[in-house]
Structures are given as structure tokens and as C-alpha cells.
């Protein structure tokens, strides 16, 4: 699984749904800002 790079990627809200004619990525931060280490990458396992 790849690490998540906060600095190089832009982000799109997964659940908001999309305008069928206009897909775009927002430039806001990812949905969770880690409290303990806000600049460290995070990853997610699909099957725990």
C-alpha cells in the first residue's frame, strides 16, 4: 500500500457526489489532520 503524500496531492471529497459534467479536485487538505504528527503520511488498510 502506498503512503499518502499530503504535499503533492490535491483532494476531492469522496462522499459529496459529483457534477456529471465536471469532475475536479479541490486543493483543500485531506479530511483528517493527524493531531500527533500532522506532517506524517498516513495509510489505510482495506482488509484489517
Amino acid at each position: 500500500m502506498e503512503d499518502f503524500n499530503m504535499e503533492s496531492d490535491s483532494f476531492e471529497d469522496f462522499w459529496k457526489g459529483e457534477d456529471l459534467s465536471n469532475y475536479s479536485y479541490s486543493s483543500t487538505l485531506p479530511p483528517f489532520l493527524l493531531d500527533a504528527a500532522p506532517c506524517e503520511p498516513e495509510s489505510l488498510e482495506i482488509n484489517k
Epitope: 502506498e2 499518502f4 496531492d9 490535491s10 483532494f11 476531492e12 471529497d13 469522496f14 462522499w15 459529496k16 457526489g17 459529483e18 456529471l20 469532475y23 479536485y25 483543500t28 487538505l29 485531506p30 479530511p31 483528517f32 489532520l33 493527524l34 493531531d35 500527533a36 489505510l44
Partner: antibody
Framework: QVQLVQSGAEVKKPGSSVKVSCKAS????????ISWVRQAPGQGPEWMGW????????NYAQKFQGRVTMTRDTSISTAYMELSRLRPDDTAVYYC?????????????WGQGTLVTVSS | QAVLTQPSSLSASPGASVSLTCTLR?????????IYWYQQKPGSPPQFLLR?????????GSGVPSRFSGSRDASANAGILLISGLRSEDEADYYC?????????FGGGTQLTVLG
Amino acid sequence: QVQLVQSGAEVKKPGSSVKVSCKASGGTLSSYAISWVRQAPGQGPEWMGWINPNSGGTNYAQKFQGRVTMTRDTSISTAYMELSRLRPDDTAVYYCASGYCSPSGCYVYWGQGTLVTVSS
Amino acid sequence: QAVLTQPSSLSASPGASVSLTCTLRSGINVGAYRIYWYQQKPGSPPQFLLRYKSDSDKQQGSGVPSRFSGSRDASANAGILLISGLRSEDEADYYCAIWHSSAWVFGGGTQLTVLG
């Protein structure tokens, strides 16, 4: 790793309300929508709506309009879903979920689920 | 008629390739939608696998193996989840979903059984 941690199972009487919480453990809620999805026993998922944690803005599925209320308390990184006028067919596992996509892939987070049983 | 229709069950042997279909209701054109696919195992929430609209508009879920892929069959007005090199751990329920009329709509799911 960020996790969404939900409140425990509930048993409710028909006509009453239930309020389920969803806390971001290890992180803080940000601007991305938190959806609530329920799943009745043996059935597929059913989307109930979402809340924008920053603004508090909501988008409810038509089926639940007038019966569901989604709120959040950013000071404790927690979102809430309240469903009123409960019926037996509201018996389901209720999940919160959030996530985002970057050009390199999508990251989707789910709570562990909260079983709500509606029974007289 | 349901917005999204999936076959209720499917079985295949380890190592095989399987195609799970998600047929959109007549009047809803598959070419206009991203089709989202989820895997769910008993006692766990659904897990996002991938979304697919076209070869230039597709994304994998984080950590999802490349043997899970998407496509579409325009003639059948259906989205397709292809699982290659089937493994025993792929035994699960699979759901498709689309964003339609300002709401997320899920299919009824396909129960995939891995034989043997």
C-alpha cells in the same frame, strides 16, 4: 492511523429516537463530508445523507427527510446522526464514513458500525 | 424497477477470473456515471474497491490489489467489476453504487462464493 469510532449498540422502542455518534480517533474532522449509511439484516447498504463538518451543512436522502438530523461538534471531533419516530424496519447497523480521492487513489474510512434494534 | 441491479449470487474456483455486473435502469446511461464498487465481509463495514467511468476516469481504493479492475458494457448498460486470480479471501458480498439525483444509490449486492 485515523479511525472513526462509533457509539455502542442501542435498543429502542417504536416511536422513540436514537442518536449515534462517530468520533475521529487520532485525528480531527476537517472539511470533507461524513456520510451515514445503514444496512438492515441481509440487505444492501442504504445511504442516509451527509454532513459537512466545517459548515454543518447537510444533504439528506429524500427517504429520511424530516426524520433524520445530522450534526457535529468539532471541538470533540465527533459527528452525530439522530433518527426519530423509529419503526421496527429501522433495525439496522448504522455506519459513518468519510474519505477523499487524490489523483493517485481513494482513501475511504468507515466506523465499525452501531447496531440499532427497534422492538416493542 | 431498481436503479441498480446485481445478480444475487455467483460462484467460481480459485484462480479463475470473474465478472460481476451492475446493470443500470433503462434511461440511466452507464456512460454518464462513475460506478463505485465495494466489498463487504460478514461483521465488517463495506470497503471501497474502485470506481470506474472510463479508462481515463478510474481510481483504485487505497491498498486494493490491481487484480480488482473496472470496466463497462455499454450495450448492456452495465458496470463491471473484474476480479482476476480469484482467491479464497475474495469470498464476500460485492455492491455497486452511483451518485444519482443528488443521492448515493446502492445495488442489492452479489454474494461471491469461492469454491473448493
